[in-house]
């Protein structure tokens, strides 16, 4: 399978888009990432605090026979019905031996606000 | 504006070497993964090679894997493609593109393309 | 590999019609495709990708939508412009793979 080469750069292939809408609405926000080895567990941030009880889910694909080969993984945070508490910036975070990475941000906002 | 300006095409015999190079400008090129993918003559389109922003992390198609390294000089704002051992089958139109932010594996911006024959 | 799909080569359609060009992944890629539209002499132009965000500046006549291994690129009322080639791409893991394409003609 394909290996990226390592390094000490992020891991993160994509990052949080930006949501904009009304009261209800429904909408995603993911973050992708390839990884050498086993996959962490994704984390989301909002306003740089650790969402507990996110609707996340986490999707990982091994590229290889080998538990060392690379992964895909693609973390989805769904917003069922966006109210104002849902309003800020979203990160995803990953410890990953040592280091812990976080994604660039996207935000989430109201119209009208 | 974004603009890629891909150069460095040529024709070239079997095994020879090529280097192509894209300038980027209209952007922090360093906050974007760019690719290589090039364009056959029936159309079809196959990714070369990508790298992250800041060159750490690189992948390759496996068939250009040992003959061809995509590296970047963030400093220039310049994508390269160092092509060797190259095969007729390589002939193509090469694009260099720019990683969306929310996936560097979809390309948002392309360059015009830089031809590359490989004939004898 | 991840093997992309498009079972027609091409599609015939008149000014202001409704046309949906599909795409197939040989396995679940979550909604990790793009689209991309390419007129002769012209490099691609993304107008989608995760399955449904439109690229910035592109018109909402467009729309993508899909999930698991299926998906599919609208063009509502479409416009003499929108003639061109059309591409899907799996953005989920490398190798990255295109589609063959789709050709969009008139009538």
């Known amino acids: 399978a394909p290996r990226g080469t390592q390094a000490e750069e992020s891991p993160f292939v994509g990052n949080p888009g930006n949501i904009t809408g009304a009261r209800g609405l429904t909408g995603t926000l993911r973050c992708q990432l390839q990884v050498q080895g086993e996959p962490p567990e994704v984390h989301w941030l909002r306003d740089g605090q650790i969402l507990e009880l996110a609707d996340s889910t986490q999707t990982q694909v091994p590229l290889g026979e080998d538990e060392q080969d690379d992964w895909i993984v693609v973390s989805q945070l769904r917003i069922t019905s966006l109210q104002l508490s849902d309003t800020g910036q979203y990160q995803c975070l990953v410890f990953l031996g040592h280091q812990t990475f976080v994604s660039q941000p996207g935000y989430v906002g109201l119209e009208g606000l | 504006e974004v603009n890629l300006v891909e150069s460095g095409g040529g024709v070239v015999k079997p095994g020879a070497s090529l280097k192509l190079s894209c300038e980027a400008s209209?952007?922090?090129?360093?906050?974007?993964?760019m690719s290589w993918v090039r364009q056959t003559s029936d159309k079809r389109l196959e990714w070369v090679a990508s790298?992250?922003?800041?060159?750490?992390?690189?992948y390759y198609l496996d068939n250009v894997k040992g003959r061809f390294i995509i590296s970047r000089e963030n400093a220039k704002n310049t994508l390269y493609l160092q092509m060797s051992s190259l095969k007729s089958e390589d002939t193509a139109l090469f694009y260099c593109?720019?990683?969306?932010?929310?996936?560097?594996?979809?390309?948002?911006?392309w360059g015009q393309g830089s031809s590359v024959t490989v004939s004898s | 590999v991840i093997v992309m799909t498009q079972s027609h080569k091409f599609m015939s359609t008149s000014v202001g019609d409704r046309v949906s060009i599909t795409c197939k992944a040989s396995?679940?890629?979550?909604?990790?495709v793009a689209w991309y539209q390419q007129k002769p002499g012209q490099s691609p132009k993304l107008l989608i990708y995760?399955?449904?965000t439109r690229h910035t500046g592109v018109p909402d006549r467009f729309t993508g939508s899909g999930s698991g291994t299926d998906y599919s690129l609208t063009i509502s009322n479409v416009q003499t412009e929108d003639l061109a080639f059309y591409y899907c791409?799996?953005?989920?893991?490398?190798?990255?793979?295109f589609g063959a394409g789709t050709k969009l003609e008139l009538k």
């Open positions: 791409q799996q953005h989920f893991t490398t190798p990255l793979t």
């Open positions: 593109a720019r990683g969306a932010r929310a996936s560097y594996f979809a390309m948002d911006y």
């Open positions: 995760w399955a449904s």
């Open positions: 209209g952007f922090t090129f360093s906050n974007y993964g």
């Open positions: 790298i992250s922003g800041g060159g750490g992390r690189t």
């Open positions: 396995q679940d890629v979550t909604t990790a």
